[in-house]
């Protein structure tokens, strides 16, 4: 039975041209995390594998940095970066856990971080 929950940075906003850290945390399970995939809608951004380390998709190499931890840093943000981001935790023996983050990239300096929330 899957007992874990994923806590994410939730709904967040950031300024155009700035950077943001996408973070997820898996808790309430002893399952081993073998890999974390980061996706934006239907595009692979990056993968962190327990054995192989990080792989950043070539088309995002200039604007995506691995970490901190299993998180992902997006740099040089544009309005087109607004949207849903998913952290997909592959674990053994539990299986797959998915967390969702919504990022809004704003033109002005009114960006604020949203509250943290949990996805079971």
């Amino acid at each position: 039975m899957m007992t874990g929950t994923i806590e994410t940075t939730g709904n967040i906003s950031a300024e155009k041209g700035g950077s943001i850290i996408l973070q997820c945390h898996l808790s309430s399970t002893t399952a081993q995390v073998t890999q974390v995939n980061w996706e934006q809608q239907d595009q692979l951004l990056a993968i962190c594998n327990a054995d192989l380390g990080w792989h950043i998709s070539p088309s995002f190499k200039d604007r995506v940095a691995p970490g901190p931890g299993l998180g992902l840093t997006l740099q040089s943000l544009t309005v087109n970066d607004t949207g849903e981001y998913f952290c997909i935790y592959h674990t053994y023996p539990d299986g797959t856990y998915t967390g969702r983050i919504f990022l809004e990239v704003l033109e002005s300096s009114v960006a604020e971080h949203g509250a943290r929330f949990q996805i079971p």
Epitope: T34, Q35, E39, D42, Q43, L44, I47, N49, D51, L52, H55, S57, S59, H90, Y92, P93
Partner: antibody, heavy 118, light 107 residues
């Protein structure tokens, strides 16, 4: 240089058994998931089986489930496919393949031909 | 199981032509789609992974696009060495499945 070298193919009668091996070199074998993919003469590619890097999980195509067993020996950098109760439709070139991040096949062996015929 | 449907099954083209091959999944596979090239008597070779990422060492005339259920492999200017069979493959879920292949022949 990454190398995958299959062996063990040959002619076998229906109902017989074969064990394929794939010797890996040029990379840290124990860090990668490995797959077997086959191709019948003149046909397309068919995934057969896969095994995680730490041997914790194995997966099989329905067409071979219960007859084929995938395994690996990380200390010997070798992947295996034990094939039992072979059928004529198992006739194919069998490729071993390296799969980083459980996502794409970036290296293939040269293949070994298995012919099941009486 | 996820079915992968490739079209066309074969095509004839000339050197310098722009060639497009499509692959459709029977359900959404996000960007878990890879493209391979195979020449007669040889093992397949990875061209594109994760729908649009060019594998290291593959010429830039190859490109991939799409997400969800519909994907495209494009060869911007066909070269003599590109005449081969091309396969798509989904790695979204087990069993992994391949398209039926597209044979690119010389016109």
């Amino acid at each position: 240089e990454v190398q995958l070298l299959e062996s063990g193919g040959g002619l076998v009668q229906p109902g017989g058994s074969l064990r394929l091996s794939c010797a890996a070199s040029g990379f840290t074998f124990s860090s990668y998931s490995m797959h077997w993919v086959r191709q019948a003469p003149g046909k397309g590619l068919e995934w057969v089986a896969s095994i995680k890097s730490d041997t914790s999980s194995t997966y099989y195509a329905d067409s071979v489930k219960g007859r084929f067993t995938i395994s690996r020996d990380n200390s010997k950098n070798t992947l295996y496919l034990q094939m039992n109760s072979l059928r004529a439709e198992d006739t194919a070139v069998y490729y071993c393949a390296r799969v980083p991040y459980d996502y794409w096949i970036d290296y293939w062996g040269q293949g070994t031909l298995v012919t099941v015929s009486s | 199981d996820i079915q992968m449907t490739q079209s066309p099954s074969s095509l004839s083209a000339s050197v310098g032509d722009r060639v497009t091959i499509t692959c459709r999944a029977s359900q959404s596979i996000s960007s878990y789609l890879n493209w391979y090239q195979q020449k007669p008597g040889k093992a397949p070779k990875l061209l594109i992974y994760a729908a649009s990422s060019l594998q290291s060492g593959v010429p830039s005339r190859f490109s991939g696009s799409g997400s969800g259920t519909d994907f495209t492999l494009t060869i911007s200017s066909l070269q003599p060495e590109d005449f081969a069979t091309y396969y798509c493959q989904q790695s979204y879920s087990t069993p992994l499945t391949f398209g039926g292949g597209t044979k690119v022949e010389i016109k």
